[in-house]
């Protein structure tokens, strides 16, 4: 049974041309985390692989570092990084557990971070 | 230049180990994995194995764990695949592979291994 | 693991004319898949990485597509020098799997 639940920053804001943290924390289990995936939409960001390290998609690493942690940073922010990123938890026993983020790229100077909060996960088994 | 020089063929018999070299040479040896694909007579490509230089981390595919063993010597550039308790099926071509997020830019040239007794 | 299946085992197209290889992934793999080229008695070679990224040096009558679990790679006009195995690869999660290969062949 899985049990874990992901944290994840929520709903976001950040500036154009700024740079923006994208978190997530897995709790409530015990499954061990061989690999975290960072998505968007349809492409892969990063990979961050227990036993081999990160790696970033060679079409993003120019503006994406990362961490901290398991987190991911995007930098040189645009108004086309708007949309949805997904951090996909693999882990064993358990599968998958996936967190989801909204980003919103905005022109002026009313970013502001949404509060941290959890959300509903989604997951299957491998 | 980007090259990957392996070893030569081997002919070993059942029960034996096998040792596979791949000497890398034209860039930074540390800065990208090396993967270990091999090719049965008339069978699809089979991934086996990674190790990053760098942090010596491996990462083994499950059917494979404790038979094979993934390593790399940094001040050679080389790394270095050994199979253990030979059989039959392990038969196949053997490639090492530069890993650049987990795709395979850059392959040698292939080491024959046959199993026969 | 995630199962890659290639369709068709084998193909033959005339010359200039379009080859399309599928790929299907067993589970979500988002744009994580690559796909080799592979000549009898040489190394497999790039061709294209990250379902869509045309690898350097590669001509541009290669191209690939898809994302999540379906992918596709397509010659636009065959060529003598295109004769070989092709096989698609998961780069998404380990073990990076790889399809069964689809034989391109001359008509």
């Known amino acids: 049974m899985m049990t874990g639940t992901i944290e994840t920053t929520g709903n976001i804001s950040a500036e154009k041309g700024g740079s923006i943290i994208l978190q997530c924390h897995l709790s409530s289990t015990t499954a061990q985390v061989t690999q975290v995936n960072w998505e968007q939409q349809d492409q892969l960001l990063a990979i961050c692989n227990a036993d081999l390290g990160w790696h970033i998609s060679p079409s993003f690493k120019d503006r994406v570092a990362p961490g901290p942690g398991l987190g991911l940073t995007l930098q040189s922010l645009t108004v086309n990084d708007t949309g949805e990123y997904f951090c996909i938890y693999h882990t064993y026993p358990d599968g998958t557990y996936t967190g989801r983020i909204f980003l919103e790229v905005l022109e002026s100077s009313v970013a502001e971070h949404g509060a941290r909060f959890q959300i509903p996960h989604h997951h299957h088994h491998h | 230049e980007v090259q990957l020089v392996q070893s030569g063929a081997e002919v070993k018999k059942p029960g034996a180990s096998v040792k596979v070299s791949c000497k890398a040479s034209?860039?930074?040896?540390?800065?990208?994995?090396i993967e270990w694909v091999r090719q049965a007579p008339g069978q699809r490509l089979e991934w086996m194995g990674v190790?990053?230089?760098?942090?010596?981390?491996?990462n083994y595919k499950e059917k494979f764990k404790g038979r094979v063993t993934i390593t790399a010597d940094k001040s050679s550039s080389t790394a270095y695949m050994e199979l253990s308790s030979l059989r039959s099926e392990d038969t196949a071509v053997y490639y090492c592979?530069?890993?650049?997020?987990?795709?395979?830019?850059?392959w040698g040239q292939g080491t024959t291994v046959t199993v026969s007794s | 693991d995630i199962v890659m299946t290639q369709s068709p085992d084998s193909l033959a197209v005339s010359l200039g004319e379009r080859a399309t290889i599928n790929c299907k992934a067993s589970?979500?793999?988002?744009?994580?898949v690559a796909w080799y080229q592979h000549k009898p008695g040489q190394s497999p070679k790039l061709l294209i990485y990250?379902?869509?990224y045309r690898y350097t040096g590669v001509p541009d009558r290669f191209s690939g597509s898809g994302s999540g679990t379906d992918f596709t790679l397509t010659i636009s006009s065959l060529q003598a020098e295109d004769v070989a195995v092709y096989y698609c690869q998961q780069h998404y999660n380990t073990p990076h799997t790889f399809g069964g290969g689809t034989k391109v062949e001359i008509k």
């Open positions: 034209g860039y930074a040896f540390t800065n990208y994995l």
């Open positions: 589970q979500h793999v988002s744009n994580g």
């Open positions: 592979a530069r890993g650049e997020y987990f795709f395979f830019d850059y």
């Open positions: 190790i990053n230089p760098g942090s010596g981390g491996t």
């Open positions: 990250s379902a869509s």
